[in-house]
C-alpha cells in the first residue's frame, strides 16, 4: 500500500466515463479540454530525452481505415505525483490508459530517471477490455524501499511507432540521516587548532549536526550539514563524533580518536652485530613514534676508559633501517653505546646503554731501519729490521710479512714471505741475477697486516761481481731510501 502519499495534483478517475461519441478534430480546442474529461491536453512531441520525460504526451488522433471518424488522442491518466515514505516500507503505484481496441500489441514499459527498468522488478500489467476500448493498468511495486529507490518513475507505451509517456511519479524515500563524510582520526600538535568535517544527507532535509567531544556536546545549537568543527587545541587524546539529526531521527558517526603528537619513546634492544678493530655494527628496535613519523636517529658513543676525557661521539643517521655502522673507533677499546631518535616534536630519551668492544687492530707503523745485504756466496739476500713501536690497541705482534719484487729487463715478479714475531732478520734466495730486488716489510698482528716500510732496493749483479755493502732504509727525515751497490 502507498504510505504517506502526498499528491501534488488531484488524481483523475482510473476509468473515465464513456468516450465521446463524436470526437473533435480541432487540436487547438483539444488543448483546452477540462481535465475531468479523462484526457490530458494534446501536445506535439519529439522523442523523449533520457531523464527528462515529456509529461502528458499523447498520440495524435488518426483517421480509421474506413476514413469515417478520428480516434481520440491517447494519454496516460493523471495519478499521484509524489509519494513520500519511510525506508523499509512497501510501495505500489500505477499508471493507467484507455486504448481503443483497434490498436494491437500495446506494451507498457517502466522507466526510472531516464533508464528502462528491466529484469527482476515487480511490474504487472492488467488489461480490462470493453466494447470500444481496453483499460490498461500498469502497476509497479517495491518491497522494503531503500534510498536507492528514490527517483522519478514513468510509464511508456508504444503505439503505431508513437511513444506515449506518463506524468512522472516521484518516489521520495525518507530515513535517518546518512553520512557522506565522517570525521577522521588525526594526530595533532598539542594546543594547536585543527578542523574536523561531518556531512550527512536525508531525505528528509535539513540535516542538523551536533559535535561531541569526549561525550560532551560541543555545540548546543546545531549547524546545518555540512559542518566543519574547528577544535581550538587539545592537551590530551580526545574522541570526537558527530550526530546528524533530521525529522526521522538521529544517526551517530563513528567515534574517532585524535592523538596528541609527542616525543618518541626511547629505542630498545640495542644489539651488537659485528665488531672490527675500528667499527661496530649495531641495530635497535625503535620505540613508540609518539604519533609522528621518525625523522632520524642519533648514535651516541662514549669510550669506557678511565683515562679518556669522557667525551661523547655523536653519529646521526636515518631512522630506517634501524641499523648503523659506527666507524673511526680505536682498536681494542671498550665503548658504551646508546641510541636516540627524533620526530617533528623532538628527541626521545636515550636507549639503555650497552657495552661493546672493538677487536685488535693491525699495526699502525712499519718496521724501522730495514737493511738489505747481498750474500753472494750463499746466493741469497740478507734482510734486517727493527721491531716497530706498536700501540697496545694493535694487539700482540705475531710476525712480519716481507714483500720482495724482482725486476730485470721486461720481467717483474713479487714474492711474499712470512716470518715469526721473534725474528728481526730474514734471508731470501736470489730469484734473478742482473736484476733489482725491492724489499718492503710489514708487521702483522691478529688484527691484520700493518703498513709496509718504505721500499729498499738492491741490485743483484751477474755471477762473480760482489759488493757486500748493504742497502737500507734511511734514517727518519731522509726523503729517499739509499741504494748501495
Amino acid at each position: 500500500a502507498i504510505t504517506e502519499a502526498r499528491e501534488e495534483a488531484k488524481p483523475y478517475p482510473l476509468f473515465p466515463g464513456p468516450l465521446p461519441g463524436s470526437l473533435q478534430t480541432d487540436h487547438t480546442s483539444l488543448l483546452s479540454l477540462p481535465h475531468t474529461s479523462g484526457y490530458q491536453p494534446a501536445l506535439m512531441f519529439s522523442p523523449t530525452q533520457p531523464g527528462r520525460p515529456y509529461t502528458g504526451n499523447v498520440a495524435i488522433p488518426r483517421v480509421t481505415s474506413a476514413g469515417s471518424k478520428l480516434l481520440p488522442p491517447l494519454a496516460f491518466k493523471h495519478t499521484v505525483g509524489h509519494i513520500i515514505l519511510s525506508e523499509h516500507k512497501d510501495v505500489k503505484f500505477n499508471c493507467s490508459i484507455s486504448v481503443p481496441n483497434i490498436y494491437q500489441d500495446t506494451t507498457i514499459s517502466w522507466w526510472k530517471d531516464g533508464k528502462e527498468l528491466l529484469g527482476a522488478h515487480h511490474a504487472i500489467t492488467q488489461f480490462y477490455p470493453d466494447d470500444e476500448v481496453t483499460a490498461i493498468i500498469a502497476s509497479f511495486s517495491i518491497t522494503s524501499v531503500q534510498r536507492s529507490d528514490n527517483g522519478s518513475y514513468i510509464c511508456k507505451m508504444k503505439i503505431n511507432n508513437e511513444e506515449i509517456v506518463s506524468d512522472p511519479i516521484y518516489i521520495e524515500v525518507q530515513g535517518l540521516p546518512h553520512f557522506t563524510k565522517q570525521p577522521e582520526s588525526m594526530n595533532v600538535t598539542r594546543n594547536t587548532a585543527f578542523n574536523l568535517t561531518c556531512q550527512a544527507v536525508g531525505p528528509p532535509e535539513p540535516v542538523n549536526i551536533f559535535w561531541v567531544q569526549n561525550s560532551s556536546r560541543v555545540n548546543e545549537q546545531p549547524e546545518k550539514s555540512p559542518s566543519v568543527l574547528t577544535v581550538p587545541g587539545l592537551t590530551e587524546m580526545a574522541v570526537f563524533s558527530c550526530e546528524a539529526h533530521n525529522d526521522k531521527g538521529l544517526t551517530v558517526s563513528k567515534g574517532v580518536q585524535i592523538n596528541i603528537k609527542a616525543i618518541p619513546s626511547p629505542p630498545t634492544e640495542v644489539s651488537i652485530h659485528n665488531s672490527t678493530a675500528h667499527s661496530i655494527l649495531i641495530s635497535w628496535v625503535p620505540g613508540f613514534d609518539g604519533y609522528s613519523p621518525f625523522r632520524n636517529c642519533s648514535v651516541q658513543v662514549k669510550e669506557v676508559d678511565p683515562l679518556s676525557n669522557g667525551s661523547v661521539m655523536i653519529f646521526n643517521t636515518s631512522a630506517s633501517p634501524h641499523m648503523y655502522q659506527i666507524k673511526q673507533l680505536q682498536a681494542l677499546a671498550n665503548y658504551s653505546i646508546g641510541v636516540s631518535c627524533m620526530n617533528e616534536i623532538g628527541w626521545s630519551a636515550v636507549s639503555p646503554w650497552i657495552l661493546a668492544s672493538t677487536t685488535e687492530g693491525a699495526p699502525s707503523v712499519a718496521p724501522l731501519n730495514v737493511t738489505v745485504f747481498l750474500n753472494e756466496s750463499r746466493d741469497n739476500v740478507d734482510i734486517r729490521w727493527m721491531k716497530p713501536l706498536t700501540k697496545r690497541q694493535a694487539g700482540e705482534l705475531v710476525g712480519y710479512r716481507i714483500s720482495h719484487v724482482w725486476q730485470s729487463a721486461g720481467i717483474s715478479k713479487e714474492l711474499l714471505e712470512e716470518v715469526g714475531q721473534n725474528n728481526s732478520r730474514a734471508q731470501i734466495s736470489v730469484q734473478v741475477h742482473n736484476a733489482t730486488c725491492t724489499v718492503r716489510i710489514a708487521a702483522v698482528t691478529k688484527g691484520g697486516v700493518g703498513p709496509f716500510s718504505d721500499p729498499v732496493k738492491i741490485f743483484i749483479p751477474a755471477h762473480g761481481w760482489v759488493d757486500h755493502a748493504p742497502s737500507s732504509t734511511p734514517a727518519p727525515g731522509n726523503a729517499d731510501p739509499v741504494l748501495i751497490i
Epitope: N191, N214, S216, V218, E220, Q221, P232, G233
Partner: antibody, heavy 118, light 106 residues
Framework: QVQLVQSGSELKKPGASVKVSCKAS????????MSWVRQAPGQGLEWMGW????????TYTDDFKGRFVFSLDTSVSTAYLQISSLKAEDTAVYYC???????????WGQGTLVTVSS | EIVLTQSPATLSLSPGERATLSCRAS?????MHWYQQKPGQAPRLLIY???NLASGIPARFSGSGSGTDFTLTISRLEPEDFAVYYC?????????FGGGTKLEIK
C-alpha cells in the same frame, strides 16, 4: 563589529513582571545561541541557560526554571528574558551573551539592571 | 555540577609585575575560559579553550592547564589590567563560573 544592545534599567515591585530585550547586530542571528547570565550585586556570574535562535527552544538551568522565560523575535534579531513574580532576590544585572562552540560567551550585552523593591 | 574555585580571592600587585591566577575544578573539565570584568562593565572574553587568546586581547595574557588545574597568567601588568577575573568551564552541563579573583593595585 558584533554588538548586543540591551534594554535599559528597570525598577519593579515584588510580584510584577519584567521583560529585558537584547538586540543583536552584525552577524547572522540564527547561527549562534543566546545565553543569559545573572550577576547579583557584588557577586559572581551565574549562567541561567540559553535559547536556540534557530528553533526557538529554550534551555534553563535548575535554578532558573519556572519564573524565567527566554524568547525570540528573529525578524528583529532580538532575544528576550522575561521574569514573572519578581522577588527582591531577583535584583541583579542580567546579561545576554552570544553562545558559541565549547560554551564560549564571546560577545556580551552591556547588561540590564533589574531592581526589585517595594 | 562542577564547582570552580579561584585563588587567591584577591591579588595585590604593582604594574610591571607578573600575575598568576588559579582556577581549580571539582572534577575534570574539557576546557577553561577566562573573562575580565571591570566595575560597571560587562565581562569580556580573554582566553577561550584553556590557552587561546580571544580577538583583540594583548599577548601578555596567556592560559594553561588541563584536567582540574588551570592558570591565567599576565606576564607584565599594565594599569588597565586591574579588574576581576572569572574562569568558566566547558565539559559538563551546566556551565559554571568561578567565584572570581580581584586583581588590585598594591
Amino acid at each position: 563589529q558584533v554588538q548586543l544592545v540591551q534594554s535599559g534599567s528597570e525598577l519593579k515591585k515584588p510580584g510584577a513582571s519584567v521583560k529585558v530585550s537584547c538586540k543583536a547586530s552584525s552577524y547572522t542571528f540564527t547561527t549562534y545561541g543566546m545565553s543569559w547570565v545573572r550577576q547579583a550585586p557584588g557577586q559572581g556570574l551565574e549562567w541561567m541557560g540559553w535559547i536556540n535562535t534557530d528553533s526557538g527552544v529554550p534551555t534553563y538551568t535548575d535554578d532558573f526554571k519556572g519564573r524565567f522565560v527566554f524568547s525570540l523575535d528573529t525578524s528583529v534579531s532580538t532575544a528576550y528574558l522575561q521574569i514573572s513574580s519578581l522577588k527582591a532576590e531577583d535584583t541583579a544585572v542580567y546579561y545576554c551573551a552570544r553562545y558559541t562552540n565549547y560554551g564560549v560567551f564571546d560577545y556580551w550585552g552591556q547588561g540590564t539592571l533589574v531592581t526589585v523593591s517595594s | 555540577e562542577i564547582v570552580l574555585t579561584q585563588s587567591p580571592a584577591t591579588l595585590s600587585l604593582s604594574p610591571g609585575e607578573r600575575a598568576t591566577l588559579s582556577c581549580r575544578a571539582s572534577s575534570s573539565v574539557g576546557y577553561m575560559h577566562w573573562y575580565q570584568q571591570k566595575p560597571g562593565q560587562a565581562p569580556r572574553l580573554l582566553i577561550y579553550a584553556t590557552s587561546n587568546l580571544a580577538s583583540g586581547i594583548p599577548a601578555r595574557f596567556s592560559g594553561s592547564g588541563s584536567g582540574t588545574d588551570f592558570t591565567l597568567t599576565i606576564s607584565r601588568l599594565e594599569p588597565e589590567d586591574f579588574a576581576v577575573y572569572y574562569c568558566q568551564q566547558w565539559g559538563s552541563l551546566p556551565f559554571t563560573f568561578g567565584g572570581g579573583t580581584k586583581l588590585e593595585i598594591k
